[in-house]
Interface confidence: low
Amino acid sequence: EEELQVIQPDKSVLVAAGETATLRCTATSLIPVGPIQWFRGAGPGRELIYNQKEGHFPRVTTVSDLTKRNNMDFSIRIGNITPADAGTYYCVKFRKGSPDDVEFKSGAGTELSVRAKPSAPVVSGPAARATPQHTVSFTCESHGFSPRDITLKWFKNGNELSDFQTNVDPVGESVSYSIHSTAKVVLTREDVHSQVICEVAHVTLQGDPLRGTANLSETIRVPPTLEVTQQPVRAENQVNVTCQVRKFYPQRLQLTWLENGNVSRTETASTVTENKDGTYNWMSWLLVNVSAHRDDVKLTCQVEHDGQPAVSKSHDLKVSAHPKEQGSNTAAENTGSNERNIY
């Protein structure tokens, strides 16, 4: 009779993470008598996966009933596959011996590849806001994928970025891999509405990459420009002075009026107007009773934006041409700055 052969018909098997792998194995003869064992890997360090005779293998089930006398099908199923299960599996026939069974013949092996999708890329930006013309770094991370081959691209508003560095870890063989990339982005004043996108392509995604995004509105600070102007006289003894705060982001802004260095009024930007580029404009105005002043008045609009050091713009108000009204003790009238807006 022809000598027993152990046949593993599948050179390779591809399984999605979380699923069940079927590893096929048949013997060509019932002789010699003895059990089958499955191993991952070859040589002295091989790992026992299933032993027909003894042991507890909760993830392994046999395809057919190995207790049947004439059974020659030794295929197994391994449940809940993870990338850690990847490797070459050998079906090995043992000959009954005393005291121990003796290895008789091995199958050619079946390589189990596990495909695991990368996690959704997570993009994170700098901890603190930065102003236009500054370069900021964004990081992108994705984990748990297998095989190792992966591609990562960065985009800003659909335009591909080139200034980035990417690492896939670990460098050597592993059950699954992670990717980490850092991109440098130069901010412009128009970036309030901009997006940075990290795109990850992997064989398991069938050509449709995963994307992670970060909004530059979380990263950018556009400082305001200030303009203080004197409006035509409302009444004979009143002058209207406006402070236009333009093109700022984010909205958090506090404005203080100073008359000759003394605080006249402080207010917080509330009813702002939004520009097309996402920045804001705001206007505050102050009614100055010139009859209360003997000399020229230095009016200062001081703005503290998003917790940054204050910026200011001053305007010299000439009062010498105005007749003095006796008995007036109000230097500035507290007016709501939000009722009117020139934008």
């Epitope: 591809l14 392509a201 064989v203 050509g207």
Partner: antibody, heavy 119, light 112 residues
């Protein structure tokens, strides 16, 4: 051996829907993508979309986005494609094909289901 | 969508001769991670299509070595070095790099 079994033919009324099946055997169903392809006489082959049975991730050809819905039943290793609001333009042979994700190739094909839309 | 244009539309070849089919894509079909997913399929009369070549030049298991694929970027070729009677049918190229994936219009190979 790998097999994809599809019913031979379906006769359906205009305006109705039909659910085509594709029963897979001989391999681990959840390990490979399943593609669907349309073939009309003289008109060659059109890719409709595909589905990953392990997590029901789908990709569609936009042309078929409102026409076809791809689903799977892992317990029976069966892929389905539902075609809705049928017109004579939908009369065609529809193939399911296994997609091997490492190189995207459709390595095994079903025999196709011939759908005839007629009143 | 990527348009795949095959030439010629039909081809009549004597047994034992070489046949060559061209496929041109309307844009590069190099995938974002470097591979070119260009495939060739043969559909014999009354049968479903069968995979011949994947990733431009790799023969699928069981495909005779008289079939070979070549090309890059947007221009691809399928060659049959010695045509046999069983090779007749319609040959399709297919790109799997950009969704929606698209087939060429097909080339009918006839035996003289």
């Amino acid at each position: 051996q790998v097999q994809l079994q599809q019913p031979g033919a379906e006769l359906v009324r205009p305006g109705s829907s039909v659910k085509l099946s594709c029963k897979a055997s001989g391999y681990t169903f959840t390990s490979y993508w399943m593609h669907w392809v349309k073939q009309r006489p003289i008109q060659g082959l059109e890719w409709i979309g595909n589905i990953d049975p392990s997590d029901s991730d789908t990709h569609y050809n936009q042309k078929f986005k409102d026409k076809a819905t791809l689903t799977v039943d892992k317990s029976s290793s069966t892929a389905y494609m539902q075609l809705s609001s049928l017109t004579s333009e939908d009369s065609a042979v529809y193939y399911c094909a296994r997609g091997y994700s490492k190189y995207y190739a459709m390595d095994y094909w079903g025999q196709g289901t011939s759908v005839t839309v007629s009143s | 969508d990527v348009l795949m244009t095959q030439t010629p539309l039909s081809l009549s070849v004597s047994l034992g001769d070489q046949a060559s089919i061209s496929c041109r894509s309307s844009q590069s079909i190099v995938h974002s991670y470097g591979n070119t997913y260009l495939e060739w399929y043969l559909q014999k009369p009354g049968q479903s299509p069968k995979l011949l070549i994947y990733k431009v030049s790799n023969r699928f298991s069981g495909v005779p070595d008289r079939f070979s694929g070549s090309g890059s970027g947007t221009d691809f070729t399928l060659k049959i070095s010695r045509v046999e009677a069983e090779d007749l049918g319609v040959y399709y190229c297919f790109q799997g790099s950009h969704v929606p994936y698209t087939f060429g219009g097909g080339t009918k190979l006839e035996i003289k």
